[in-house]
C-alpha cells in the first residue's frame, strides 16, 4: 500500500486527505498541519517544513483544529445581559455561560448573548416544563384537574388540591385551578349561605 | 451545511469589465480565507485571488493589476473585480472559502466568463 503523505504535501486539487487536521495552502498548492485545539500557528508552514504551534496564552483560547496566528480572547459572561458562568474559559474553550434563574434567552448568535426576565403566569397557570432551562420565555398552560395556582409567578407550579378527609375534615367549598379546597371541622355547622334547606 | 452561489458571469468584450459575486449561506460563521480560483477550457483549475481573514490580498501574476478582489463579511459575500478582460481569461470561475479557525472548506457551483 501507499505510504500516507505527512504534511506538508503537494495537493493538485485543492483538497487535503485529513479535512479535520489539516489544511489546504493555495500559493504553495500544498497541505500543512492545522493547530490542534489550544493552540495557535507560531510559524506558517511551508513547502519544506510543516505548520509550528504553540499554546495559547493565558485568558485565551482556540476550540477547534485551525490555522489562526492568535489564540482568542476569553470573555466573561456579562451580568448586565443576565448571563452567569457555569464552566470556565480553558485554552481549548472559551467561557460557557447561561441565563440567570427566573430569565430567558432572548437573543441568540451562535450562543445567548442576552436575557430577559421570564413573563408571570397568571393565577390558575403554571410555566409549561422546558427540555432546557433558560432557552425561551414562559408558555402558561392551565393547571389539570385536581390542583390550583394562586400567584402570578414565572415558576410557581400548581398544586393538587387538599383532601379534607385525609385530615379528617370535610370540604366547605370546593377547589378551583386557581384556589385551595376548603375545608372544615365536620362538627361546625355550614355558614348560612351554604346550608340546605331547612324543614319545619 | 455552507452554499456558496457565484453570480455575475457572462459574455464580454476584449477590455471589458465583469463583477463576480459569491454569497455563502446556511451555517456561516467563523473566521475564513476567501479565494477566486478558474478552470480555463481543457486546462487545470488556477488560483486566481485571496482574501484572508487576516484582511490580506494576493493576485496570480496573470492577473496582477486588472482583477480586485473584496470582501463585505456584513453580507457573507466575496467579490472579484474584473477590468481590461482578455481571451485568455476566459474560463468557469469558481468561488472557494475556507475556515481558518475550525475544520471547513467549501466550493461554488461556477459561473463561466467569456471574452
Known amino acids: 500500500s501507499q505510504p500516507q503523505a505527512v504534511p506538508p504535501y503537494a495537493s493538485e486539487n485543492q483538497t487535503c486527505r485529513d479535512q479535520e487536521k489539516e489544511y489546504y495552502e493555495p500559493q504553495h498548492r500544498i497541505c500543512c498541519s492545522r493547530c490542534p485545539p489550544g493552540t495557535y500557528v507560531s510559524a506558517k508552514c511551508s513547502r519544506i517544513r510543516d505548520t509550528v504551534c504553540a499554546t495559547c496564552a493565558e485568558n485565551s483560547y482556540n476550540e477547534h483544529w485551525n490555522y489562526l496566528t492568535i489564540c482568542q480572547l476569553c470573555r466573561p459572561c456579562d451580568p448586565v445581559m443576565g448571563l452567569e458562568e457555569i464552566a470556565p474559559c480553558t485554552s481549548k474553550r472559551k467561557t460557557q455561560c447561561r441565563c440567570q434563574p427566573g430569565m430567558f434567552c432572548a437573543a441568540w448568535a451562535l450562543e445567548c448573548t442576552h436575557c430577559e426576565l421570564l413573563s408571570d403566569c397568571p393565577p390558575g397557570t403554571e410555566a409549561e416544563l422546558k427540555d432546557e432551562v433558560g432557552k425561551g420565555n414562559n408558555h402558561c398552560v392551565p393547571c389539570k384537574a385536581g390542583h390550583f395556582q394562586n400567584t402570578s409567578s414565572p415558576s410557581a407550579r400548581c398544586q393538587p388540591h387538599t383532601r379534607c378527609e385525609n385530615q379528617g375534615l370535610v370540604e366547605a367549598a370546593p377547589g378551583t385551578a386557581q384556589s385551595d379546597t376548603t375545608c372544615k371541622n365536620p362538627l361546625e355547622p355550614l355558614p348560612p349561605e351554604m346550608s340546605g334547606t331547612m324543614l319545619m | 451545511e455552507v452554499q456558496l452561489v457565484e453570480s455575475g458571469g457572462g459574455l464580454v468584450q476584449p477590455g471589458g469589465s465583469l463583477r463576480l459575486s459569491c454569497a455563502a449561506s446556511?451555517?456561516?460563521?467563523?473566521?475564513?480565507?476567501m479565494y477566486w480560483y478558474r478552470q480555463p477550457p481543457g486546462k487545470q483549475r488556477e488560483l486566481v485571488a485571496i482574501?484572508?481573514?487576516?484582511?490580506?490580498?494576493n493576485y496570480a501574476d496573470s492577473v496582477k493589476g486588472r482583477f480586485t478582489i473584496s470582501r463585505d463579511n456584513a453580507k457573507n459575500t466575496v467579490y472579484l473585480q474584473m477590468n481590461s478582460l482578455r481571451p485568455e481569461d476566459t474560463a468557469v470561475y469558481y468561488c472557494?472559502?475556507?475556515?481558518?479557525?475550525?475544520?471547513?472548506?467549501?466550493w461554488g457551483q461556477g459561473t463561466l466568463v467569456t471574452v
Open positions: 472557494n472559502i475556507q475556515r481558518v479557525d475550525a475544520p471547513g472548506m467549501y
Open positions: 446556511g451555517r456561516f460563521f467563523g473566521i475564513y480565507d
Open positions: 482574501s484572508t481573514s487576516g484582511g490580506h490580498t
